[in-house]
Interface confidence: medium
């Protein structure tokens, strides 16, 4: 069977006026997954995103990540989109005072 990913979105200061937002998917099986950043609901171009390899996490499941740099104050326009084994979910960037947003997708 399939194991749905845990999705976790974090933010970190990059440079003045910019932040890096990272979307991590973990503990999923099988390894095929779509993970991408979207602006206004539409996927960003590949050259503005950085992807991690899909790696085994030691429990028979997998993990990966995608990151992009965005302008501070525009966070609400960005979401992380995940698609795995026919299920999908959308994950917002957490506000500045809350650094984590995670969701186990069923």
């Amino acid at each position: 069977g399939s194991v749905p990913p845990m999705v976790n979105v974090t933010r970190s200061e990059a440079s003045e006026g910019n932040i890096t937002v990272t979307c991590r998917a973990s503990s999923f099986y099988p390894r095929n997954i779509t993970l991408t950043w979207r602006q206004d609901g539409v996927s960003l171009s590949h050259d503005t995103q950085q992807w991690g390899d899909v790696l085994p996490d030691g429990n028979g499941t997998y993990q990966t990540w995608v990151a992009t740099r965005i302008c501070q104050g525009e966070e609400q326009r960005f979401t992380c989109y995940m698609e795995h084994s026919g299920n999908h979910s959308t994950h917002p960037v957490p506000s500045g005072n809350s650094h984590h947003h995670h969701h186990h997708h069923h």
Epitope: D40, L44, S45, Q76, T79, Y81, T90, P92
Partner: antibody, heavy 122, light 112 residues
């Protein structure tokens, strides 16, 4: 696919405000972007703004920034648009529509409500 | 704003004819992610618009294959291979690549 149920017709006086609703069912509300559009009788369509139901984040057509305010209530799965300082120019049918961004689709207004007629008259 | 210009304004057809509607944008409508978000909608009298074509040439679910979209850059076309009675109404092109998203003025397809 799901449903988009819009509120009934409104007759309002110039200068007043009105709040239109778009109640949804049959899909994961918080995953979706919902847009509002305006159509005057016999004319084309204008996009007003979208709102992302997951966070309440929104983006506006600059033309409508001082006219429209979008909100969502996730508990009732309803999107709202408040129109303020109404004039006869605001008389139109207002539609809500759901975006379809899943997979490779990338379709803007895939599913529509039936529209709400707003008439501004003294 | 991107201006979307449709021609013709009115298109009289006989049932079974091929119909062709043109849409020209005032600038290139390629999104920064390299997709072209050009769509076509049909609005029948007294109804909400319905999506026919997205991303220039992709038919939306349930749309008959007699509808086809093509084009690139600033020039786009919707073709109906054999017009049926249920195809009558106003057709709008739309661009979602640049904010504010904008519609064409519409083309009314009616019986000759």
């Amino acid at each position: 696919q799901g449903q988009m149920q819009q509120s009934g017709a409104e007759l309002v006086k110039p200068g007043a405000s009105v709040k239109l609703s778009c109640k949804t069912s049959g899909f994961t509300f918080s995953d979706n972007y919902i847009s509002w559009l305006k159509q005057k009788p016999g004319q084309s369509l204008e996009w007003i703004a979208w709102i992302y139901a997951g966070t309440g984040g929104s983006s506006y057509n600059q033309k409508f920034r001082d006219k429209a305010q979008l909100t969502v209530d996730t508990s009732s799965r309803t999107a709202y648009m408040q129109l303020s300082s109404l004039t006869t120019e605001d008389s139109a049918i207002y539609y809500c529509a759901r975006h379809d961004y899943y997979g490779t689709s990338g379709a803007w207004f895939a599913y529509w409500g039936r529209g709400t007629l707003v008439t501004v008259s003294a | 704003d991107v201006l979307m210009t449709q021609t013709p304004l009115s298109l009289p057809v006989s049932l079974g004819d091929q119909a062709s509607i043109s849409c020209r944008s005032s600038q290139h409508i390629v999104h920064s992610n390299e997709n072209t978000y050009l769509e076509w909608y049909l609005q029948k009298p007294g109804q909400s618009p319905k999506l026919l074509i997205y991303k220039v040439s992709n038919r939306f679910s349930g749309v008959p294959d007699r509808f086809s979209g093509s084009g690139s850059g600033t020039d786009f076309t919707l073709k109906i291979s054999r017009v049926e009675a249920e195809d009558l109404g106003v057709y709008y092109c739309f661009q979602g690549s640049h904010v504010p998203w904008t519609f064409g003025g519409g083309t009314k397809v009616e019986i000759k």
